[in-house]
Interface confidence: low
């Protein structure tokens, strides 16, 4: 349904409100060096002109794009060359190509301070001195850091972030009632980002079938009883929101999110009997809930997958008429028949029938080319079983902290050339799946470890892109999205490498680091473990744990001296120099 | 399974102190939030203080702010309340109790109880 | 401080009597960041340390019976026994989570007839 003036149409779908928070979303995802205060004037100019629009559709450039009119009011920044040098080129260019222009600019890891949260106090004096203002930033801040947040959901924390000031600062204990509250939204808010930045990876990279076949997998496991054509109709209108929201079309995507939660509630019956609740949510609480809802049991007697995709006559000619289709009521049928499955596992193995049926149904005797298809799942079914059994054990040995130490010296070096942080980081989130998936049963490990291992390596392909150093990470991040994991996975030492020159420097520390937090603390060691993996990659287990634990110690000896600046000065070359000594250096 | 065993308790003059203690084991104690709640002879029950054991954040009622501080061992999985100037109506069953990881003002396990008594 | 009102002092009910058990608060308990209320009931039996029943005013604590039930939203609060048991003898404590102190009703006695 075409309207006349888009901008209008957004504006009234989506409310002021909604509609002025969702243009600084946009804005803050392209511009993410701009000061908050310019940001601001901008978004205000914005809804400014879409008011006139609202009361005269026919009034002059109501009748742009929503691409042209953004992309205007971002190119008529004045630092914009400065600041962001040649991201400036864009705004020469012509809609689409500018758009597309500002989304490869898009920074995923932009060079911004750390967030430091201030004192409840403070907090709480600047939510009631000015609310708007207060929640307007927030939105701002993670915007900016987090260039592919999902806008919509960004929305929902922003109203819980609300709610949290509201409710703790007049609290007896601010914070006790508020800390926990935004260590809470920081925590989900990082999950949400590096999840929705699979997703975007997923349709920028791999396109739209990819994406499609990821949400018939995981659609079709949450509602098992849903008909294939009704699935296929949700899998259509969310490849649309999603679509929307990488592209950085962020007002249309929060509106068709909105219509796609009221569909689904009109339709429940014939969806999930478990969205009853959700349904009676208000919007944002509702779409989100529907997300994340859990999966409907599975219908009763469902017939044998056999019937249908190995023994029938036609299968082949199914297949001829409508591959995707086919392929696509396959994955439904086995998702829904597997919560217990990864979904990358699931596409794994729609992959493998795929390539079966292209090689059988060319054959002399089709049928008896693909009989024993399923015969082929065993092995990769059984791989990430294996993998996910042997890390659980490990880390219910070990502890988080010892686990992601195990994963950092194995990620290191297999992939040494990749930069420390980056390595430290992705390290620190792999090693999570411990504490986040081995605590449950064997039926919901697979689903929960290895789709949140495909979020973050994601993480670590996003990382590398921006500066690549390493083929094997590129060959494994570019060739199949569903084995990332795998192709990790199967990576051995990197026998290419040319060990790091030692610098001491590096292996010097300072007295600040007995103020930092644990958390803080724990990444200068794995900093200091990554960094000596890159210098003697052959070092045992032994070595390094015997390394370690000398730093260990050395840390908390300087942190309780009196002189502690002059004790890390002068331990720390001892320490060095046995360090050097024990692993040959 | 889920183990909260406090120990500690005693008689103790008025003005007397006191140092209670609570071993944890069973789940992964960094991430929870653990209180002490107490319980007069045959009155009901009566929170006093709590801690997240992740930060350390803490908070009391104000029947006991300024007198008892509450503190833990993360590498030990022990939580402490340490009682100064007692007073004869601190007198009780002290129970440590496990709140839930975001929604702390449940608790979930409990301990079996010290008995404080403070009396001349 | 919230301050939390139980109703009755005591009870007395034979086996397979429903009991109702009810709690009031002096102000709305319901979290602004989740639209749910944070009402736990606890049940103390004699000689024996609080076990959780039920927490959100009616979710059920695992491993409880389903003969126990939460109700109410805001400020009013029900807890039911649908049919009592020898077992169920005890006193029953609801109790506030939403903000500190965390503040327990005075206690419902329940007896065996």
């Known amino acids: 349904d075409a309207h006349k003036s888009e901008v209008a149409h957004r504006f009234k779908d989506l409310g002021e409100e909604n509609f002025k928070a969702l243009v600084l979303i946009a804005f803050a995802q392209y511009l993410q060096q701009c000061p908050f205060e310019d940001h601001v004037k901008l978004v205000n100019e914005v809804t400014e002109f879409a008011k006139t629009c609202v009361a005269d559709e026919s009034a002059e450039n109501c009748d742009k794009s929503l691409h042209t009119l953004f992309g205007d009011k971002l190119c008529t920044v004045a630092t914009l060359r400065e600041t962001y040098g040649e991201m400036a080129d864009c705004c020469a260019k012509q809609e689409p190509e500018r758009n597309e222009c500002f989304l490869q600019h898009k920074d995923d890891n932009p060079n911004l301070p750390r967030l430091v949260r201030p004192e409840v106090d403070v907090m709480c004096t600047a939510f009631h001195d000015n609310e708007e203002t207060f929640l307007k930033k927030y939105l701002y801040e993670i915007a900016r850091r987090h260039p592919y947040f999902y806008a919509p959901e960004l929305l929902f924390f922003a109203k819980r972030y609300k709610a949290a000031f509201t409710e703790c600062c007049q609290a007896a204990d601010k914070a006790a009632c508020l800390l926990p509250k935004l260590d809470e939204l920081r925590d989900e808010g990082k999950a949400s980002s590096a999840k929705q930045r699979l997703k975007c990876a997923s349709l920028q990279k791999f396109g739209e079938r990819a994406f499609k076949a990821w949400a018939v997998a995981r659609l079709s496991q949450r509602f098992p009883k849903a008909e294939f054509a009704e699935v296929s109709k949700l899998v259509t209108d969310l490849t649309k929101v999603h679509t929307e929201c990488c592209h950085g079309d962020l007002l249309e995507c929060a509106d068709d999110r909105a219509d796609l939660a009221k569909y689904i509630c009109e339709n429940q019956d014939s969806i999930s009997s478990k969205l009853k609740e959700c349904c009676e949510k208000p919007l944002l609480e509702k779409s989100h809930c529907i997300a994340e809802v859990e999966n409907d049991e599975m219908p009763a007697d469902l017939p044998s997958l056999a019937a249908d995709f190995v023994e029938s006559k036609d299968v082949c000619k199914n297949y001829a008429e409508a591959k995707d289709v086919f392929l696509g009521m396959f994955l439904y049928e086995y998702a829904r028949r597997h919560p217990d499955y990864s979904v990358v596992l699931l596409l794994r193995l729609a992959k493998t029938y795929e390539t079966t049926l292209e090689k059988c149904c060319a054959a002399a005797d089709p049928h008896e080319c693909y009989a024993k298809v399923f015969d082929e799942f065993k092995p990769l079914v059984e791989e990430p079983q294996n993998l996910i059994k042997q890390n659980c054990e490990l880390f219910e040995q070990l502890g988080e902290y010892k686990f992601q130490n195990a994963l950092l010296v194995r990620y290191t070096k297999k992939v040494p050339q990749v930069s420390t942080p980056t390595l430290v980081e992705v390290s620190r989130n792999l090693g999570k799946v411990g504490s986040k998936c081995c605590k449950h049963p064997e039926a919901k490990r697979m689903p929960c470890a290895e789709d949140y291992l495909s979020v973050v390596l994601n993480q670590l392909c996003v990382l590398h892109e921006k500066t690549p150093v390493s083929d094997r990470v590129t060959k494994c991040c570019t060739e199949s999205l569903v084995n990332r994991r795998p192709c990790f996975s199967a990576l051995e030492v990197d026998e290419t490498y040319v060990p790091k020159e030692f610098n001491a420097e590096t292996f010097t520390f300072h007295a600040d680091i007995c103020t930092l937090s644990e958390k803080e603390r724990q990444i200068k060691k794995q900093t200091a473990l990554v960094e000596l993996v890159k210098h003697k990659p052959k070092a045992t287990k032994e070595q390094l744990k015997a390394v370690m634990d000398d730093f260990a110690a050395f840390v908390e000896k300087c942190c309780k001296a009196d002189d502690k600046e002059t004790c890390f000065a002068e331990e720390g070359k001892k320490l060095v120099a046995a360090s050097q000594a024990a692993l040959g250096l | 399974e889920v183990q909260l065993q406090e120990s500690g308790g005693g008689l103790v003059q008025p003005g007397g102190s006191l140092r209670l203690s609570c071993a944890a084991s069973g789940f992964t104690f960094g991430r929870y939030w653990i209180h002490w709640v107490r319980q007069a002879p045959g009155k009901g029950l009566e929170w006093v203080s709590g801690i997240s054991i992740g930060d350390g954040t803490t908070y009391y009622a104000d029947s006991v702010r300024g007198r008892f501080t509450i503190s833990r061992d993360k590498a030990k999985n022990t939580l402490a309340l340490t009682m100064n100037s007692l007073k004869s109506e601190d007198t009780a069953v002290y129970y440590c109790?496990?709140?839930?990881?975001?929604?702390?003002?449940?608790?979930?396990?409990w301990g079996q109880g010290t008995q404080v008594t403070v009396s001349s | 401080d919230i301050v939390m009102t139980q109703s009755p002092r005591s009870v007395t009910a034979s086996v397979g009597e429903k009991v109702t058990i009810n709690c009031k608060s002096s102000?709305?308990?319901?979290?602004?960041?989740?639209?749910?209320?944070?009402l736990n009931w606890y049940q103390q039996r004699p000689g024996q340390s609080p076990r959780l029943l039920i927490y959100l005013a009616s979710t059920r604590e695992s491993g409880v019976p389903d003969r126990f039930s939460g109700s109410g939203s805001t400020t009013d609060f029900t807890l039911t026994i649908s049919s009592f048991q020898p077992e169920d003898v005890a006193v029953y404590y609801c109790q506030q989570g939403y903000g500190t102190p965390f503040s327990f009703g005075s206690g419902t006695r329940l007896e065996i007839k």
């Open positions: 102000q709305s308990v319901v979290s602004g960041s989740n639209q749910k209320s944070l």
């Open positions: 109790a496990k709140g839930g990881i975001v929604y702390f003002g449940a608790y979930d396990s």
